[in-house]
């Protein structure tokens, strides 16, 4: 707590600038008035000010608004937001995405912190959904954001904003995770081609079911080893040796690689010999 | 990557005003302020000013105060400058750069390509 | 204002020579940035607030000082090291450079 002492005389602010910074941090606290600071918060980060004085700037805000800021405050924090602890930001009503990207742009290049955690939980809550920009934003500066979602929280999801998935956001995503999305991106790219489809449903396909694997082995779809590896086991095992050789076409060369892994090694065992001597890969059930 | 992207070279008359641009990419256009520099040809850098793209508080050395205007449109990442009542003393390379604000840094630490304006009659 | 004086204006330097580039300024400041720039083209951060070396800087550059005295020191001396330096200050507005210091290969 910086301890109250009064501002000496002709050292009163009358705006936010530069001239703050020659300011010792009980100067700033006696002398720069909160509300003028929370009007011209857009001021503070071309202003070179230390640690130590953005602390006492911090400070004088919270006691302006002990039950939070405001998001006029909020969308200027800059450094500042680093500053924060989620109890402050619980406090926060964050509804502006442009604010949403101005503080996560400040923690770039950083792991998601507890501060940042909180903030996305925040306003994903206030707007009730992971809607299309929302999703978009936040998969921009954590590409593995979706698959820190539990499942229940996936459920969410509305189908439009799968159009916003790209394929490295699904790369940490574990099977449960991949069941609950995948009937959303089947919902969402369903009026599209087939070749189309596949590319845009191939990331997802980890939590197909074996009718969908069945249907995509009809369409030529030529996918490829690392797609298949991903796939549920329990989808893979009902597959016959021609659906599988459909469904990877020229990949299917690929499986005499992966014959120790799974899900090509319980497939293997489910298949009869014969039909795997078919594929000339020297196979062993 | 952080990307500025100036505008093409202007020739203008003298009295003339022009206005160039800068697209920022690669990063969150609102939360730098942009800055803007002169270099006049085989001269050094003069700072002119900056713009807070998110609330379009500017500031202007006081020099360049009635020569320059900023400005800034969020939706197209893009700040704007216009010069006005040129004169040969306009003539020279106009930079934008963003301006980090970090405690640790406070630097303009991306650079666009500059702007050449001549001005001759 | 903050005038940044630098010297000397022009200098060169042999290759492996050891370089001093001074920035004097009028009052003080507490950091100091450095730009490198090239014929052609934007400057370059090259060392932030005094003593940093920017991404992709060499380090036998180093920066030093306090107050109205600062400097930009090259170990070794490289030909890619020919080019303008300039001074920044950043503690008051207007933010002002140095004059700029030309170091040619010799």
């Known amino acids: 707590e910086v301890e109250k002492t009064a501002c000496p005389s002709g050292k009163k602010a009358p705006e936010i600038d530069e001239s703050l910074i020659f300011y010792k941090k009980w100067e700033l606290e006696a002398c720069v008035d909160a509300a003028l600071l929370a009007t011209q918060m857009d001021r503070v980060n071309a202003i070179p000010f230390t640690y130590e004085q953005l602390d006492v700037l911090k400070h004088k805000l919270d006691e302006l608004y002990p039950q939070g800021y405001p998001e006029s405050v909020i969308q200027h924090l800059g450094y500042l937001f680093l500053k924060m602890s989620p109890e402050d930001i619980r406090k926060w009503n964050v509804t502006s995405l442009e604010t949403l990207k101005a503080l996560l742009e400040v923690n770039k290049g950083h792991e998601m912190s507890p501060q940042v955690a909180t903030l996305i939980d925040r306003f994903v809550k206030g707007r009730g959904q992971l809607d299309k920009d929302t999703l978009d934003t936040l998969t921009a500066f954590y590409p593995g954001y979706l698959c820190s979602l539990s499942p229940e929280e996936l459920s969410s999801v509305p189908p439009s904003s799968i159009w916003a998935v790209r394929p490295q956001d699904l790369d940490t995503c574990d099977p449960r995770q991949l069941d609950v999305l995948y009937p959303k991106a089947r919902l969402a790219f369903q009026n599209m081609n087939g070749s189309e489809y596949f590319v845009k449903i191939q990331s997802f396909l980890g939590g197909a079911p074996t009718e969908d694997l069945k249907a995509l082995s009809q369409q030529n779809v030529s996918m490829d080893l690392a797609t298949f590896m991903k796939l549920r086991t329990d989808a893979v095992l009902p597959l016959t040796v021609a659906e599988v050789q459909k469904l990877l076409g020229p990949h299917v060369e690929g499986l005499k690689a992966e014959e120790r892994h799974r899900p090509v090694r319980d497939w293997i065992l489910r298949q009869r010999q014969d039909d795997l001597d078919t594929l000339g890969l020297g196979l062993q059930g | 990557q952080v990307q500025l992207q100036q505008s093409g070279a202007e020739l203008a008359r003298p009295g003339a005003s022009v206005k160039m641009s800068c697209k920022a990419s690669?990063?969150?256009?609102?939360?730098?302020?942009m800055h803007w520099v002169k270099q006049r040809p085989g001269q050094g850098l003069e700072w002119i000013g900056y713009?807070?793209?998110?609330?379009?508080?500017?500031k202007y050395n006081q020099k360049f105060k009635d020569k320059a205007t900023l400005t800034a449109d969020k939706s197209s990442s893009t700040a704007y400058m216009q010069l006005n009542s040129l004169t040969s003393e306009d003539s020279a390379v106009y930079y934008c750069?963003?301006?980090?604000?970090?405690?640790?840094?406070?630097?303009?630490?991306?650079w666009g390509q500059g702007t050449s304006v001549t001005v001759s009659s | 204002q903050i005038v940044l004086t630098q010297s000397p204006a022009i200098m060169s330097a042999s290759p492996g020579e050891k370089v001093t580039i001074t920035c004097s300024a009028s009052?003080?400041?507490?950091?100091m940035h450095w730009f490198q720039q090239k014929p052609g083209t934007s400057p370059k951060l090259w060392i932030y607030?005094?003593?940093n070396l920017a991404s992709g800087v060499p380090a036998r550059f180093s920066g030093s000082g306090s107050g109205t005295s600062y400097s930009l020191t090259i170990s070794r001396m490289e030909a890619e090291d020919a080019a303008t330096y300039y001074c920044?200050?950043?503690?008051?507005?207007?933010?002002?450079f140095g004059g700029g210091t030309k170091l040619e290969l010799k």
């Open positions: 713009i807070n793209p998110s609330s379009g508080y500017t």
């Open positions: 920044q200050q950043r503690s008051s507005y207007p933010l002002t």
């Open positions: 750069a963003r301006y980090y604000s970090n405690p640790d840094y406070y630097a303009m630490d991306y």
């Open positions: 690669g990063y969150t256009f609102i939360s730098y302020t």
């Open positions: 607030s005094t003593s």
């Open positions: 009052s003080s400041v507490s950091y």
